[in-house]
């Protein structure tokens, strides 16, 4: 949950690609005004996930979830939250 | 803002060699089945995507990272 808060559109696109759902990917890409060549490039990546099957998608999703919830990212998220709190306090 | 570790993973997936990408994945999930899967996906992407495709994927990532939704 926390990871999606950091950059929700990234995780929208990533999980649409890894999920193999072309419609979902199109919807996500529309949100960032993707050009046709950009869509084509993302669909080539999506094809690799589709070709390699469900287990492959699950395993790669696991990797992304692990990285996103690692101390490398969570430490960053905590630091950003602290900075935000400082700014909010100073702003009052 | 996207986490730098995630950005690094995605950059290596697109612009690193398979060995470099797998080495990065191993830092987080060192299971043989996960690493083998990472290599298969990476090799597939390298086989399918041209230089231009990769440029386009990178330009899309720029849009994602600078989007108000990020």
């Amino acid at each position: 949950v926390k990871m999606a808060e950091t950059c929700p559109i990234f995780y929208d696109v990533f999980f649409a690609v890894a999920n193999g759902n072309e419609l979902l990917l199109d919807l996500s890409l529309t949100k960032v005004n993707a050009t046709e060549p950009e869509r084509t490039a993302m669909k080539k990546i999506q094809d690799c996930y589709v070709e390699n099957g469900l287990i492959s998608r699950v395993l790669d999703g696991l990797v992304m979830t692990t990285i996103s919830s690692s101390k490398d990212c969570m430490g960053e998220a905590v630091q950003n939250t602290v900075e935000d709190l400082k700014l909010n306090t100073l702003g009052r | 803002e996207i986490c730098p570790a995630v950005k690094r993973d995605v950059d290596l997936f697109l612009t690193g060699t398979p060995d470099e990408y797998v080495e990065q994945v191993a830092q987080y999930k060192a299971l043989p089945v996960v690493l083998e899967n990472a290599r298969i996906l990476k090799n597939c992407v390298d086989a399918k995507m041209t230089e231009e495709d990769k440029e386009n994927a990178l330009s899309l990532l720029d849009k994602i990272y600078t989007s108000p939704l990020c």
């Epitope: - | 730098p4 950059d11 690193g16 060699t17 470099e20 041209t50 990769k54 440029e55």
Partner: antibody, heavy 119, light 107 residues
Framework: EVQLVESGGGLVKPGGSLRLSCAAS????????INWVRQAPGKGLEWVSL????????YYADSVKGRFTVSRDNAKNSLYLQMNSLRAEDTAVYYC????????????WGQGTTVTVSS | DIQVTQSPSPLSASVGDRVTITCRAS??????LAWYQQKPGRVPQLLIY???TLQSGVPSRFSGSGSGTDFTLTISSLQPEDVATYYC?????????FGQGTKLEIK
């Protein structure tokens, strides 16, 4: 035309510092990984460092690790190599070279800039 | 780290000769091997990548082969303009080590 142009070389004393620059043109600089490669007088090529397009990953040769720092400014289409604690064996022509996205080889090289470390 | 060894060096051959330069990696690198040509006083130029793929604009007399640990660069018919030093480079992962170079001269 795709081009890389190095600058900043010169004569420096052992233990001194120097900052090399590499100006890129003719391609979308921010997308490409760039290498530094050096060549000592009359010797072969030695890979020094690589920096990714967004600086998210950086690699160094053991011979320069802890002394050299690579960085880039994508807004200025520029790459830098900060060289500290220079030694006589760092004397070389320094090239920047673009790494292709699809095959990971150096397809475009600059003309090189000469660094001489001598007292 | 993986070591890369080139042989022979130097190499002297006659115009029209078939010339072969070898490169050996201390561990398997699949086909992640490139060959570069450096003419005297000039900047290195990419000749071959992925062990056997000719870079655009490179004459067809140049060819590469091999996989794993043993690789070769072949010039089918040596031309005067081929006088240069040839370097192999492994690029599967950092450090991207170069071979020591093979200086090719005309007899």
């Amino acid at each position: 035309e795709v081009q890389l142009v190095e600058s900043g070389g010169g004569l420096v004393k052992p233990g001194g510092s120097l900052r090399l620059s590499c100006a890129a043109s003719g391609f979308t600089f921010r997308n490409y990984n760039i290498n530094w490669v050096r060549q000592a007088p009359g010797k072969g090529l030695e890979w020094v460092s690589l920096i990714s397009g967004s600086s998210s990953y950086i690699y160094y040769a053991d011979s320069v690790k802890g002394r050299f720092t690579v960085s880039r400014d994508n807004a200025k289409n520029s790459l830098y190599l900060q060289m500290n604690s220079l030694r006589a064996e760092d004397t070389a022509v320094y090239y920047c070279a673009r790494r292709t996205l699809s095959y990971y080889v150096m397809d475009v090289w600059g003309q090189g800039t000469t660094v001489t470390v001598s007292s | 780290d993986i070591q890369v060894t080139q042989s022979p060096s130097p190499l002297s051959a006659s115009v029209g000769d078939r010339v072969t330069i070898t490169c050996r990696a201390s561990q398997g690198i699949s086909n992640y091997l490139a060959w570069y040509q450096q003419k005297p006083g000039r900047v290195p130029q990419l000749l071959i990548y992925a062990a056997s793929t000719l870079q655009s604009g490179v004459p067809s007399r140049f060819s590469g082969s091999g996989s794993g640990t043993d690789f070769t660069l072949t010039i089918s018919s040596l031309q005067p303009e081929d006088v240069a030093t040839y370097y192999c480079q492994k690029y599967n992962s950092a450090p991207y080590t170069f071979g020591q170079g093979t200086k090719l001269e005309i007899k």
